[in-house]
């Protein structure tokens, strides 16, 4: 017996006093536990456990399935064990065919032997196929065969336990190894949309997609700076062996303004964690904000083109857009398009293309846009710059020479006298009277200026030039003088266009 100190409890003694015992199939298993404080026998093999409160365990006709560990325990909790092999030539292996292995860990193929004296206890591939070259295993007759450091490539590997019994190779039932992959990277997480804009009362629903090698990845939706448990629904798929996808959908059936905030989809595995966020903004009602891309006061030269461009934010989506001029709606010459193709886009662009503008086409151009909640508009004041045009140039009955010119900006009229036959008129003549005729008229038309000089001041033959000009250009008109005796001849006006 084991040596123990006097008074110190000792483990029970089992008879026969062997660590391992072989009993032939059909024979009796008789095991005696001797201990003054005997409590029970227990039997274990694979996942089976039996108990017996008699101090002598008797199995009258041993079967292969009686192979296993018999443990006697006393009232002090001390125990002794004997392992009994029931040798049955017809059943060399006890098998538990469930076989799971965690990648990079060892796993046990549970095929304990009923006869420990057989040889070549090992693993073999099914249908004569070789095992993977790097597969290493360690046999143990009482437990089975341990596969060392399981690889992902072993998934669905079919194998048998094998042993040589009286010169013949015997195979167990087949095992299919299912490998649980190890996490070697953080989960991949993505969200259906990065931001959401909703009106109060609308449903908020966002889906997070979590991808990993197995379903044991953990995931949850969290609200930033809040511990409140959110309601989620899950859908999941296995796309092949080590490609798992889960969709976690968060829903708020009737969103409120105070639901606005950042929501995080968090996932972790044994390797690490990953997260992705989405932003929810809940507004009490829709809105439209317009931003002109050019100055709302536009100056354009006659005959040139101009594009009136606005960007605008509209939520919900814009329903009606129009450009208006003089109470007339443009049916063409404009386009409206979203600023981006992003599903969350609320920003749009509208462009009105005005081509070869005439002086008469200045005025207020208005962009109007509306959605189901609000209307908004913006006005552009377009001024068409035109070169002065001399409308009239006359000698009045009172001897005055009068020149009337129109243009935008307001033209300036200068007078020059050219003596004799000189072509260049340099001597300026001060006007007697200058008036802007339509200063109080429509604000976007041409401005008309009238200027007069006194022809009695001229004593010699010559030409008088009326020159009208502004920022765009200039135009001149001429009056010819001839003296016969003391009388002035009729003055013949003519114009000379100066581009």
């Amino acid at each position: 017996q084991p040596s123990v100190s006097p008074g110190e409890p000792s483990p029970p003694s089992i008879h026969p006093a062997k660590s391992e015992l072989i009993v032939r199939v059909g024979n009796e298993i008789r095991l005696l536990c001797i201990d003054p404080g005997f409590v029970k026998w227990t039997f274990e093999i694979l996942d089976e456990t039996n108990e017996n409160k008699q101090n002598e365990w008797i199995t009258e006709k041993a079967e292969a399935t009686n192979t296993g560990k018999y443990t006697c325990t006393n009232k002090h909790g001390l125990s002794s064990s004997i392992y009994v092999f029931v040798r049955d030539p017809a059943k060399l292996f006890l098998v538990d065919r469930s076989l799971y292995g965690k990648e990079d860990n060892d796993t046990l193929v549970r095929c304990p032997l009923t006869d420990p004296e057989v040889t070549s206890y090992s693993l073999k591939g099914c249908q004569g196929k070789p095992l993977p070259k790097d597969l290493r295993f360690v046999p143990d007759p009482k437990a089975g065969i341990t596969i060392k450091s399981v690889k992902r490539a072993y998934h669905r590997l079919c194998l048998h336990c094998s042993a040589d019994q009286e010169g013949k190779s015997v195979l167990s039932d087949k095992f299919i190894l299912k490998v649980r992959p190890a996490f070697k990277a953080v989960p991949v997480v993505s969200v259906s949309k990065a931001s959401y804009l909703l009106r109060e009362g609308e449903e908020f629903t966002v889906t997070c997609t979590i991808k990993d090698v197995s379903s044991s990845v953990y995931s949850t939706w969290k609200r930033e700076n809040s511990q409140t448990k959110l309601q989620e629904k899950y859908n999941s798929w296995h796309h092949g062996d080590f490609n798992y996808e889960r969709q976690a959908t968060l829903t708020i059936s009737s969103a409120r303004v105070n639901d606005s905030g950042v929501f995080m989809c968090y996932a972790n595995n044994t390797f690490g964690s990953a997260n992705v966020t989405t932003t929810l903004e809940v507004v009490d009602k829709g809105f439209i904000n317009i931003f002109p891309m050019i100055n709302t006061t536009v100056f354009v030269n006659d005959g040139e083109n101009v594009d009136l461009i606005v960007e605008y934010e509209a939520f919900p989506k814009p329903e009606h857009q129009q450009w208006i001029y003089m109470n007339r709606t443009f049916t063409d010459k404009w386009e409206d398009y979203p600023k981006s193709e992003n599903e969350s886009n609320i920003r749009y662009v509208s462009e009105l293309h005005l081509t070869r503008l005439k002086g008469t086409e200045g005025g207020t151009y208005t962009f109007l846009v509306s959605n189901s909640d609000v209307n908004a508009s913006i006005a552009f004041n377009v001024y068409v710059n035109t070169k002065p045009e001399i409308l009239t140039y006359d000698r009045l009955v009172n001897g005055m020479l009068q020149c009337v010119a129109a243009g935008f900006p307001e033209p300036t009229i200068d007078w020059y006298f050219c003596p004799g036959t000189e072509q260049r008129c340099s001597a300026s003549v001060l006007p007697v009277d200058v008036q802007t005729l339509n200063a109080s008229g429509p604000p976007f038309g041409k401005l008309v200026v009238q200027s007069s000089i006194d022809s009695s001041a001229f004593k010699h033959n010559g030409t008088v030039e009326c020159k009208a000009y502004n920022d765009v250009g200039k135009t001149s008109a001429y009056f010819n003088f001839a003296f016969k005796g003391n009388n002035k001849e009729q003055i013949h006006p003519h114009t000379l266009f100066t581009p």
């Epitope: 017996q1 084991p2 008879h15 026969p16 006093a17 062997k18 660590s19 391992e20 015992l21 072989i22 009993v23 032939r24 024979n27 009796e28 298993i29 008789r30 005696l32 008797i58 092999f85 420990p116 004296e117």
Partner: antibody, heavy 121, light 107 residues
Amino acid sequence: EVQLVESGGGLVQPGGSLRLSCAASGFTFVDHDMDWVRQAPGKGLEWVGRTRNKLGSYTTEYAASVKGRFTISRDDSKNSLYLQMNSLKTEDTAVYYCAREPKYWIDFDLWGRGTLVTVSS
Amino acid sequence: DIQMTQSPSSLSASVGDRVTITCRASQSISSYLNWYQQKPGKAPKLLIYAASSLQSGVPSRFSGSGSGTDFTLTISSLQPEDFATYYCQQSYIAPYTFGGGTKVEIK
């Protein structure tokens, strides 16, 4: 060759001591439980005692007739079994056999040739 | 201790005879019974273990049977080399007691 060879026997006076040795060869000594069996001249076989292997925690068991006087020990590194006999009596006179138990049963499947111990004044 | 009683203590037989030796245990020992053969001046030799299992290398004319308390060793056809003393031994509970032996002699 698989064998057990006993040594250390001889003539000893009553009350004396003797140490028998058993050298094992040709098999894995550490795997086996080992026993001593004796046979008095012209008599039957008598089991003396045994020592378990490492798996059996080197537990020892003895026949009532020798308990407290004889001690069985083993040295796995030397593949050797020992029987220390103290307080010898004349009735301990016998041929002492070293015997091997198989791994999975209690019987004696290999025996030494024996060594004679004579206790006499 | 478990007592083992062997009978007969001796018997005379001729070559070719069928010989039966019995062994009785004082309590049930299941199949924990072994049979040995010993020739004068030699160490014993294991013949049968676990009541009925023939030890490797032992001729098949030797057989064992029984369970519980009553056991039998049978030599189906006695051969000249079989003249020896035969012992039974229980291996259930220490001390592992032997029977007194049966001497098989030439008639």
